[in-house]
């Protein structure tokens, strides 16, 4: 199995740790972990094209999209491939991460490591919104926390 | 030209940013950027096997060394892939990092995108010191500063 | 400029069928999901109809399911809704526009009313 | 079915006033709320989207709040143009709805 690790941090009070697994090439990718200090409801979650934190978050760069697709959601056959949705914070602000993604890779040409997960200020509306950002970014907002993926024991 | 980026950072002053540059697979790794807070004089500098900072740079485990080999200088044929050797600071804080080495690559199996960049308390001793720890680590001690290196544009 | 001009409205009796379009321009309409959103005389706004930026996925609210069916010609840059077995009250202006959940620009509309 | 009480259904106000206009959800709906506005024989223009984003082209005096089932519209400084009816919309689930509208009308 190839695991990866995500330490994410950002200038306010967002923070979290997201792991991810996955059994062998070819097979879906698990994340698993928590986002702390978030704002009640959903917060668009990506992967960044760069592993670049030279200038915070903002260097990380678009959305991983090796393919040049549109923005979508996770489910979508047209999506970044660095388009996981979002995660959802309670009241308490924590987003409880669980996802199972087939899209992702932690090997081969489109790997995600040395690449940027990014939580968002706002939720991502998945491609569907009426203006031209919602093609590209779902109107996710500001980059609140981020970190580089790496490569875990 | 594949280029890589990795911001250093810990608990203390260290801090800093080192890019790495790769003009073609086979061909050597440039290393250039800069380290502030350090003390006047020689600092260990490695990249370790896993890009893990949930614990800080402690997770990032032990320098990585795909070939089981020990630990040496950047010109020793024994050496671990990880094994830059030393940066100097002047007696303002500061390394200049300016590092051609031919070991470490941005690709392949042993590609070093998605491990960790350290830093060090002290010098690295390149394997010739008296005792075990200096097949293994060089002596160079505490982890001062480190970052996960990720994909650049 | 983005654009969306409807057509096709019309008098139809009971039972009757239309078939709505709607034109875009000034925006890369492929890339888009699109919707159709109706105003009853002197009411509110309803949301019919919404389909994917490729035509894949298209959702009704249930007043219209099995009744109406929307498309699109993304080489034509058209939207169309054909209504079937329309009712009376079925009678409004119909808007197109864009997005599939909510909407930013929206067309002038076409009137539909459903009469004998 | 989401059910959303806007209110008031009429508001009667003067140019420089501040107004505030609210959507009531029978069900949380996390961010996913719109606000239009609708001029007499023209379509609808969207106004602010995800609770509190204002669509470009905007007026700041246009601002939008709240969360899970209670949102507000408020329009800081009333001006002229801004007579018109105002809608809020769902896009939390299926059917996409609105609110009946408020009508903001000259004092």
């Known amino acids: 199995a190839m695991k990866a690790v995500c330490v994410l941090k950002g200038d306010g009070p967002v923070q979290g740790t997201i792991h991810f697994e996955q059994k062998a090439s070819g097979e879906p990718v698990v994340l698993s972990g928590q986002i702390t200090g978030l704002t009640e409801g959903q917060h668009g979650f990506h992967v960044h094209q760069y592993g670049d934190n030279t200038q915070g978050c903002t260097s990380a760069g678009p959305h991983f999209n090796p393919h040049s697709k549109k923005h979508g959601g996770p489910a979508d056959e047209e999506r970044h491939v660095g388009d996981l949705g979002n995660v959802t914070a309670g009241k308490d602000g924590v987003a409880n991460v669980s996802i199972e993604d087939r899209v992702i890779s932690l090997s081969g040409e489109h790997s995600i490591i040395g690449r940027t997960m990014v939580v968002h200020e706002k939720q991502d509306d998945l491609g569907k919104g009426g203006n031209e950002e919602s093609t590209k970014t779902g109107n996710a907002g500001s980059r609140l926390a981020c970190g580089v993926i790496g490569i875990a024991q | 030209a594949m280029k890589a980026v990795c911001v250093l950072k810990g608990d203390g002053p260290v801090q800093g940013t080192i890019h790495f540059e790769q003009k073609a697979s086979g061909e050597p790794v440039v290393l250039s950027g800069q380290i502030t807070g350090l003390t006047e004089g020689q600092h260990g500098f490695h990249v370790h096997q896993y890009g893990d900072n949930t614990q800080g740079c402690t997770s990032a485990g032990p320098h990585f060394n795909p070939h089981s080999k020990k630990h040496g200088g950047p010109a020793d044929e024994e050496r671990h892939v990880g094994d830059l050797g030393n940066v100097t600071a002047g007696k303002d804080g500061v390394a200049n990092v300016s590092i051609e080495d031919r070991v470490i690559s941005l690709s392949g199996e042993h590609s070093i995108i998605g491990r960790t960049m350290v830093v060090h308390e002290k010098q690295d001793d390149l394997g010739k010191g008296g005792n075990e720890e200096s097949t293994k680590t060089g002596n160079a001690g505490s982890r001062l500063a480190c970052g996960v290196i990720g994909i650049a544009q | 400029e983005v654009q969306l001009v409807e057509s096709g409205g019309g008098l139809v009796q009971p039972g009757g069928s239309l078939r709505l379009s709607c034109a875009a321009s000034?925006?890369?309409?492929?890339?888009?999901?699109m919707s159709w959103v109706r105003q009853a005389p002197g009411k509110g706004l309803e949301w019919v109809a919404n389909?994917?930026?490729?035509?894949?996925?298209?959702d009704y609210v249930d007043s219209v399911k099995g009744r109406f069916t929307i498309s699109r010609d993304n080489a034509k840059n058209s939207l169309y809704l054909q209504m079937n077995s329309l009712r009376a009250e079925d009678t409004a202006v119909y808007y197109c526009?864009?997005?599939?959940?909510?909407?930013?620009?929206w067309g002038q509309g076409t009137l539909v009313t459903v009469s004998s | 079915v989401i059910w959303m009480t806007q209110s008031p259904s009429l508001l009667s106000a003067s140019t420089g006033d501040r107004v505030t206009i609210s959507c009531r959800m029978s069900?949380?709906?996390?961010?996913?709320l719109a606000w239009y506005q609708q001029k007499p024989g023209k379509a609808p223009e969207v106004l602010i989207y995800?609770?509190?984003t204002l669509q470009s082209g905007v007026p700041s005096r246009f601002s939008g709040s709240g969360s899970g089932t209670d949102f507000t519209l408020t329009i800081s400084c009333l001006q002229s143009e801004d007579f018109a009816t105002y809608y809020c919309?769902?896009?939390?689930?299926?059917?996409?709805?609105f609110g009946q509208g408020t009508k903001l009308e000259i004092k």
């Open positions: 526009a864009r997005g599939g959940i909510w909407f930013g620009p």
């Open positions: 000034g925006f890369t309409f492929s890339s888009f999901w």
């Open positions: 389909i994917k930026h490729d035509g894949s996925e298209q």
């Open positions: 069900q949380g709906i996390s961010s996913y």
């Open positions: 995800a609770v509190s």
């Open positions: 919309q769902q896009y939390y689930s299926f059917p996409y709805t």
